[in-house]
């Protein structure tokens, strides 16, 4: 598809990058950017560069240079970015392809003006992996006097994420939004299906478990089953086979 080379391909991919994969906020002279791992990123400043500047340098951390432009050419230094970056001297933009979590850093663009003064801009880049699909673990389902006591946990491997629980696509109250949903439901607000949505600032994934009748386990969509699945489902299957 990208027959015109890396630059054109990268430019196109950056244009097509879904907005949900890129979160930017500005605090003073420090710009915060959050992107999804594996994506291509453009680090640039919102203002135009000083006219006829003498030199421009991009750093990650404070003394590790990535690239420098000095009115004649770009110099790419030995670093983990070599071969993955390109500088546009016109705008000062630094293109980085296929960012990984290890690229998390504060990036600094330093411009030496023709007059001898310097100007500096900082971009704090946070690279997040897309969240994995959650596993819903049924800790407890108990029919208590027509009410249903329910304890579900939403499990994903060591990530810092937000949790949202839904009952038949209606969100549970905010105070119940963490990795464990523990609630007692009355018959009039029983839900057939419960969904856990895990999200970070670049992606979200759902896991769903369905109960039928309302206080017993039925089936799930996109959920890995564990011991509790066997406890509820296997006797049901055996019962059907024996009849």
């Amino acid at each position: 598809m990208c027959s015109r080379g890396w630059d054109s391909c990268l430019a196109l991919e950056l244009l097509l990058l879904p907005l949900s994969l890129l979160v930017t906020s500005i605090q003073g002279h420090l710009v915060h950017m959050t992107v999804v791992s594996g994506s291509n990123v453009t680090l640039n400043i919102s203002e135009s560069l000083p006219e006829n500047y003498k030199q421009l340098t991009w750093f990650y951390t404070f003394d590790q240079k990535i690239v420098e432009w000095d009115s004649r050419k770009s110099k790419y230094f030995e670093s983990k970015f070599k071969g993955r970056v390109r500088l546009d001297p016109q705008s000062g933009a630094l293109y980085i392809s296929k960012v990984q979590k290890e690229d998390n850093s504060t990036y600094i663009m330093r411009v030496l003006k023709k007059t001898g003064n310097e100007q500096e801009w900082k971009i704090k880049l946070q690279v997040l992996d897309p969240v994995p699909k959650p596993v819903i673990k049924i800790e407890k389902i108990e029919d208590m006097d027509d009410n249903c006591y329910l304890k579900l946990s939403c499990v994903i491997p060591g990530e810092s994420v937000n949790y949202t629980w839904y009952g038949d696509k209606r969100p549970f109250p905010k105070e119940l939004q963490n990795s464990v949903l523990e609630t007692t439901l009355m018959p009039h607000n029983y839900s057939r299906c419960y969904t856990c949505q895990v999200s970070n600032s670049v992606s979200s994934k759902n896991g769903t478990v369905c109960l039928s009748p309302p206080c017993t386990l039925a089936r799930s969509f996109g959920v890995e089953w564990i011991a509790s699945w066997l406890v509820v489902t296997v006797p049901t299957i055996l019962g059907l086979l024996l009849t």
Epitope: K54, Q55, T57, D63, Q64, K65, E68, D70, K75, F77, E78, S79, L112, K113, K114, T115, G116, N117, E118
Partner: antibody
Framework: QVRLVESGAEVKKPGASVKVSCKTS????????ITWVRQAPGRGLEWMGW????????DYAQSLQGRVTMTTDTSTSTAYMELRSLRSDDTAMYYC??????????????WGQGTLVTVSS | AIQLTQSPSSVSASVGDRVTITCRAS??????LAWYQQKPGKAPKLLMF???SLQSGVPSRFSGSGSGTDFILTISSLQPEDFATYYC?????????FGQGTKVEIK
């Protein structure tokens, strides 16, 4: 953190040569220039020259042209300054300093501790 | 070559005093000027560059001004650790050059 560590003091006879090293660490060596400055006892600072650690480009003070050579070794992140045909007025403390850019900006933000070179018969 | 002339060559001052050192270039150097502080037996330390930009880690009592040929380094309130020799240096063109230095002494 950024460090520039120079070689030890030298005592030389007039007419001899001296080669001072400046071992750097804590930064992208090739991304900066190295400047050499000397200071005779009780005197001010004298700019001797500059070398780019990126491509070896150099610029020397007119007064030292032909006697001084500045080089770098990127494999060891070390800069060298060799001064030949030493005279007694070359007795001085020799400093290496890091230029903020790979093409010289003339601003020296980190300095070595200095190497005392004494020229005496 | 560009010559730099500093004045005064020495100044006696007390802790808390405001001290100003001037540096004049023999020709216009825009803002291509740096200031260094040197204490006996130590390497110089960059204080200011671009005539008025404070080097990272340098206290804000130091300030620089000027462009073209006339430059000033000001220490707003002299501290005990500020007694030293101060040099200006032009970075406009090779060969770079330093002023002859200004010694700030305790009165």
């Amino acid at each position: 953190q950024v460090r520039l560590v120079e070689s030890g003091a030298e005592v030389k006879k007039p007419g001899a040569s001296v080669k001072v090293s400046c071992k750097t660490s804590g930064y992208t060596f090739a991304g900066y220039g190295i400047t050499w400055v000397r200071q005779a006892p009780g005197r001010g600072l004298e700019w001797m020259g500059w070398v780019s650690a990126y491509n070896g480009d150099t610029d020397y003070a007119q007064s030292l042209q032909g006697r001084v050579t500045m080089t770098t070794d990127t494999s060891t992140s070390t800069a060298y300054m060799e001064l030949r045909s030493l005279r007694s007025d070359d007795t001085a403390m020799y400093y290496c300093a890091r230029d903020r850019y790979s093409s010289s900006s003339g601003y020296f933000d980190y300095w070595g501790q200095g190497t005392l070179v004494t020229v005496s018969s | 070559a560009i010559q730099l002339t500093q004045s005064p060559s020495s100044v006696s001052a007390s802790v808390g005093d405001r001290v100003t050192i001037t540096c004049r270039a023999s020709q216009g150097i825009s803002s291509w000027l740096a200031w260094y502080q040197q204490k006996p037996g130590k390497a110089p330390k960059l204080l200011m560059f671009g005539a008025s930009s404070l080097q990272s880690g340098v206290p804000s009592r130091f300030s620089g001004s000027g462009s073209g040929t006339d430059f000033i380094l000001t220490i707003s309130s002299l501290q005990p650790e500020d007694f030293a020799t101060y040099y200006c240096q032009q970075a406009n063109s090779f060969p770079y050059s330093f002023g002859q230095g200004t010694k700030v002494e305790i009165k």
